[in-house]
Amino acid sequence: TGADTEAVVCVGTACYTAHSGKLSAAEAQNHCNQNGGNLATVKSKEEAQHVQRVLAQLLRREAALTARMSKFWIGLQREKGKCLDPSLPLKGFSWVGGGEDTPYSNWHKELRNSCISKRCVSLLLDLSQPLLPSRLPKWSEGPCGSPGSPGSNIEGFVCKFSFKGMCRPLALGGPGQVTYTTPFQTTSSSLEAVPFASAANVACGEGDKDETQSHYFLCKEKAPDVFDWGSSGPLCVSPKYGCNFNNGGCHQDCFEGGDGSFLCGCRPGFRLLDDLVTCASRNPCSSSPCRGGATCVLGPHGKNYTCRCPQGYQLDSSQLDCVDVDECQDSPCAQECVNTPGGFRCECWVGYEPGGPGEGACQDVDECALGRSPCAQGCTNTDGSFHCSCEEGYVLAGEDGTQCQDVDECVGPGGPLCDSLCFNTQGSFHCGCLPGWVLAPNGVSCTMGPVSLGPPSGPPDEEDKGEKEGSTVPRAATASPTRGPEGTPKATPTTSRPSLSSDAPITSAPLKMLAPSGSPGVWREPSIHHATAASGPQEPAGGDSSVATQNNDGTDGQK
């Protein structure tokens, strides 16, 4: 069925209409839209009370609604693909006519968690209970329905129409009937405010056709924000009743003449307006003409007024409303300026902090200052930033370049720096030699020594350690430890065996690789290599070979 029975309540600058009819939310919105409105908003407790009043009016006219729990669509919807958001008062829903999210809500129960389906909100009315201002209709969300299938218990909908202003209802000074026709095609004979552009038809008399006079008026904007009918004096006056009928149609006082005629008057502090019926305060500020936080200030002799704005705001072109002053236009800050309602604030770029001479000044943050350095080793402060550096033998590492990582010179890009064995240490390295060889005074080369079946010669003393210089010596083998049966480290080299610059054979005794003294308490394996090969030495015999084949991917075994 379509929408039929309707009720109307006009208040402030809006009218609300309630309609019965089992329509989907889209059909209901379309119905409101055709007359220039939208499904109603309920953005505050006050608005909820207006909507409740129009629903109460509708329910008084409706004979019998089919469900005890009836639902009426309002203009709160969540589009397909938009998820429920529990952190917001409107839970991710928004008003169909647009407008900002508002803090007021009145949800019936916890909302169904969904994203895929479009969801719509209706007001839930328990028809077994009287509608009380203290018990406002709850919001119920659900599917939006479809033509012919509006959804369970949907009995109607509420529309809202907004206007630039309202006229007071016409005052009748004698018997008669007023019929208002609104721009949204509703006719009513009792409105507490009548929207701009409404027509009023006044039929005077007591129903006796011979005595009936008709008047036609339009609610017009007489001056900015001033709306009236353009009528003068009370309508349908009758000497028979004088002031006794509806106070003669007067807003405040009614004065009768001896001949049955009468005039309207006003109480002290008020004046009679051009319609000769309505009274307005002599104080022009009493009608609160100023908006947006502006204060009304009376002019001399109380005749006119001006609006005054709080600090940080200025009057707009209407001279009635306050708008924020954008203080950032004057560039009051050294770096970033953020305009705020009624003011502004200065902010500093990353790497700077508030401080220095002058308002809104910024000064460099010394990231390298004691206790706040983000660098593992060296830190250099720069204007607005910083950079990290590492001691010799370390390189910058980490995603943000603040960490230092030991350079393993034994497997470095320039190749190993030692002629034979290489022991990496934190920030440095040491060279060593195979059995039967001794470390030369340069700490890098190996020279033939007395034949020995002992372990390889350990690292040189500190003063003999290899200098950290680039080298073009090609890399040979890197040994990688494994655990022996007794849990002792056992060298298992993972690259090609070394070539030695002498014909002397490598002894067949297994090599025991020793962690050099002064190295950290972790096993570091040597790298076995040599720059040139004069002749190929014999393959070592026996159990633990100190040499293994190269990885098939061409890489060295990891430490």
Partner: antibody
């Protein structure tokens, strides 16, 4: 507790269709949306689409539009995902999943997965 | 559609080390709609962190998440053997939902 139990592995020929089921238990079936995600070695995890069991409304990934159909049978708390015109690229593990009482599409519950192999 | 790029592809760390996984979006994502999943070998994905920084039920406190806009991070403060898995980020800011390519975390 919430459980999502999927139908068994499928071997299908190129050009054919496959229909996988996902039976829900431990909650009111119409309360939570049901989504389908697949996993392949090449493309990783891909969202196929989802269905709102209360209304039957669906949302599909455009990449599967025209080939995928999601349905549900509320009487047996089961969701279905049918994919047609299969190619070898559709060989994957298919999961049904939903976000239970969590918000913002954080998929809290997952089925055990259904391996679909497309091979001639 | 929003593309999520995860790095590194593989992360090899020793037990007790801190793991930092990155997820970068091709355009801004609401922090409410960015989630992390853990998938162990042969298992279904498991929700780890939802809405950028909230631990899912039963997830140990060594996992944490942070980020906003286009850059998000999953951190494992002290890696344990049981954390060996592939970790995925996922976002929603309109259909389709998308997942990152994953970061494989392994023990050195």
């Amino acid at each position: 507790q919430v459980q999502l139990v999927q139908s068994g592995a499928e071997m299908v020929k190129p050009g054919a269709s496959v229909k996988i089921s996902c039976k829900a238990s431990g909650y009111t079936f119409t309360d939570y949306e049901m989504h389908w995600v697949r996993q392949t070695p090449v493309y990783g995890l891909e969202w196929i689409g989802g269905i709102d069991p209360e209304t039957g409304d669906t949302a599909y990934n455009q990449n599967f539009k025209g080939r995928v159909t999601m349905t549900r049978d509320t009487s047996i708390s089961t969701a279905y995902m049918e994919l047609s015109r299969l190619t070898s690229d559709d060989t994957a593990v298919y999961y049904c999943t939903n976000y239970g009482n969590l918000y913002y599409y954080a998929m809290d519950y997952w089925g055990q997965g259904t391996l679909v192999t497309v091979s001639s | 559609e929003i593309v999520l790029t995860q790095s590194p592809a593989t992360l090899s760390l020793s037990p007790g080390e801190r793991a930092t996984l990155s997820c970068r979006a091709s355009s801004s994502v609401s922090s409410s709609y960015l989630h992390w999943y853990q998938q162990k070998s042969g298992a279904s994905p498991r929700l780890l962190i939802y809405s950028t920084s909230n631990l899912a039920f039963g997830i140990p406190a060594r996992f944490s998440g942070s980020g906003s806009g286009t850059d998000y991070t999953l951190t494992i403060s002290s890696l344990e053997a049981e954390d060996v898995a592939v970790y995925y980020c996922q976002q929603y800011s309109g259909y389709p939902l998308t997942f990152g390519g994953g970061t494989k975390v392994e023990i050195k």
